[in-house]
Interface confidence: medium
């Protein structure tokens, strides 16, 4: 049977569910806007947040051949060219990415706490902060550890956005993450076995993913004339 991880999973679904998970860890609910369905350059619809435990996202229409409801599902833009069929993402991919991200943030909790306080997010600086960090993160190449760091960084940005009462930014961050995955990481992921390979690699025989020499990078902090966010990008990018 076809190896769905190599024909492709929907990166948007992977991003959206990861952000949902990260926000739900902090008690936030997120009704995603029409992320990914907006034409190029258009701002996505703002998300809606709630910290009410009983709040349930509105389900979107189910999609055959699999009955499926999710606030993550957004229709393709009208008239969009039909690309290769994307397979529904196996739960084990979402779960493994969650576990890897949780492992990553646990290991570097203090660093992430510092980063959160130094991001100084505003609606006007968020895109630049995101681009700078991600560019540094992958400057020396791509590996699964850096991809996990990418997801965790996006998650931190989303949590900080909500903490600072800028919840509409979350839809934007999700869109930027999806675009970056599709444009810059997709080929590497496919060439390296797809998300199924990530699931297999993040197994008992292959841990840890994060065999990074973090301590040596502490010295970079003293050279951080370019600002805390760029520093953090370099800090992650060498891992």
């Amino acid at each position: 049977m076809a190896h769905a991880g190599r024909t492709g999973y929907d990166n948007r679904e992977i991003v959206m569910k990861y952000i949902h998970y990260k926000l739900s860890q902090r008690g936030y609910e997120w009704d995603a806007g029409d992320v990914g369905a907006a034409p190029p350059g258009a701002a996505p619809a703002p998300g809606i947040f709630s910290s009410q435990p009983g709040h349930t996202p509105h389900p979107a229409a189910s999609r055959d051949p699999v009955a499926r409801t999710s606030p993550l599902q957004t229709p393709a833009a009208p008239g969009a060219a039909a690309g290769p069929a994307l397979s529904p993402v196996p739960p084990v991919v979402h779960l493994t990415l969650r576990q890897a991200g949780d492992d990553f943030s646990r290991r570097y909790r203090r660093d992430f706490a510092e980063m959160s306080s130094q991001l100084h997010l505003t609606p006007f600086t968020a895109r630049g902060r995101f681009a700078t960090v991600v560019e540094e993160l992958f400057r020396d190449g791509v590996n699964w550890g850096r991809i996990v760091a990418f997801f965790e960084f996006g998650g931190v940005m989303c949590v900080e956005s909500v903490n600072r009462e800028m919840s509409p930014l979350v839809d934007n961050i999700a869109l930027w993450m999806t675009e970056y995955l599709n444009r810059h990481l997709h080929t590497w992921i496919q060439d390296n076995g797809g998300w199924d390979a990530f699931v297999e690699l993040y197994g008992p025989s292959m841990r840890p993913l994060f065999d990074f020499s973090w301590l040596s990078l502490k010295t970079l902090l003293s050279l951080a004339l370019v600002g805390a966010c760029i520093t953090l990008g370099a800090y992650l990018g060498h891992k």
Epitope: A4, R68, S70, P71, P90, L95, Y202
Partner: antibody, heavy 121, light 110 residues
């Protein structure tokens, strides 16, 4: 430790909907998908569907798309399955099951004790 | 919808090695099917044994192992014990149907 406590047996009339509950404890409810499985007497298992409590995404076996509705209440860490317009073929034991994962592998790991639904006129 | 087929019944003796298989109607089973094995003992007691084709669930004895044999997923019990007598269900992930269970194998250990 992980526990899934299901509601008690139900006797329902054909056509009258029935709702089964599954209260989870001993873990972070939003971190794991909850699956529902059907077992008719003397027969095998049928996967009905699953729900991700973190965002209420639901995936249903096509066979059950007009039969089962899966919901969660995060405030009480409870998952629900409602069966609409039950017929005699819906008489079965229904299980909730929490998927587990361990470094890249998924398991049907933790099961509720089952809820017997009997459809009888 | 995909159909997953298992042997309906198998018999073995204590200490013997026995292999249960799981076939897909859609073609060869691959690692992308994340073959999962579940044991059912009397009174509806279910235990997850294997996941991701080859990974034992925590706490499961080392005599249980999972693999791909030819075009099928397989569960091998090396040195079967009397307490291994049970129903064994496999489940396969399909990208368009999600999880599908097999009909189950009744294993008797005489």
């Amino acid at each position: 430790q992980v526990q899934l406590q299901q509601s008690g047996p139900q006797l329902v009339r054909p056509g009258a909907s029935v709702k089964i509950s599954c209260k989870a404890s001993g873990y972070s409810f939003t971190s794991y998908w909850m699956h529902w499985v059907k077992q008719r007497p003397g027969q095998g298992l049928e996967w009905i569907g699953m729900i991700d409590p973190s965002d209420s995404e639901t995936r249903l076996n096509q066979k059950f798309k007009d039969k089962a509705t899966l919901t969660v209440d995060k405030s009480s860490s409870t998952a629900y399955m409602q069966l609409s317009r039950p017929t005699f073929e819906d008489s079965a034991v229904y299980y909730c099951e929490r998927g587990d994962y361990y470094y890249g592998s998924s398991y049907f790991a933790y099961w509720g004790q089952g809820t017997l639904v009997t459809v009888s006129a | 919808q995909a159909v997953v087929t298992q042997e309906s019944a198998l018999t073995t003796s204590p200490g013997e090695t026995i292999t249960l298989t799981c076939r897909s109607s859609t073609g060869a089973v691959t690692t992308s099917n994340y073959a999962t094995w579940v044991q059912e003992k009397p009174d509806h007691l279910f235990t997850g044994l294997m996941g991701g084709t080859t990974y034992r669930a925590p706490g499961v004895p080392a005599r249980f192992s999972g693999s791909l044999i030819g075009d099928k997923a397989a569960l091998t019990i090396t040195g079967a014990q009397t307490e291994d007598e049970a129903m064994y269900f496999c489940a396969l992930w399909f990208s368009n149907h999600f999880w599908v269970f097999g009909g189950g194998t009744k294993l008797t250990v005489l």
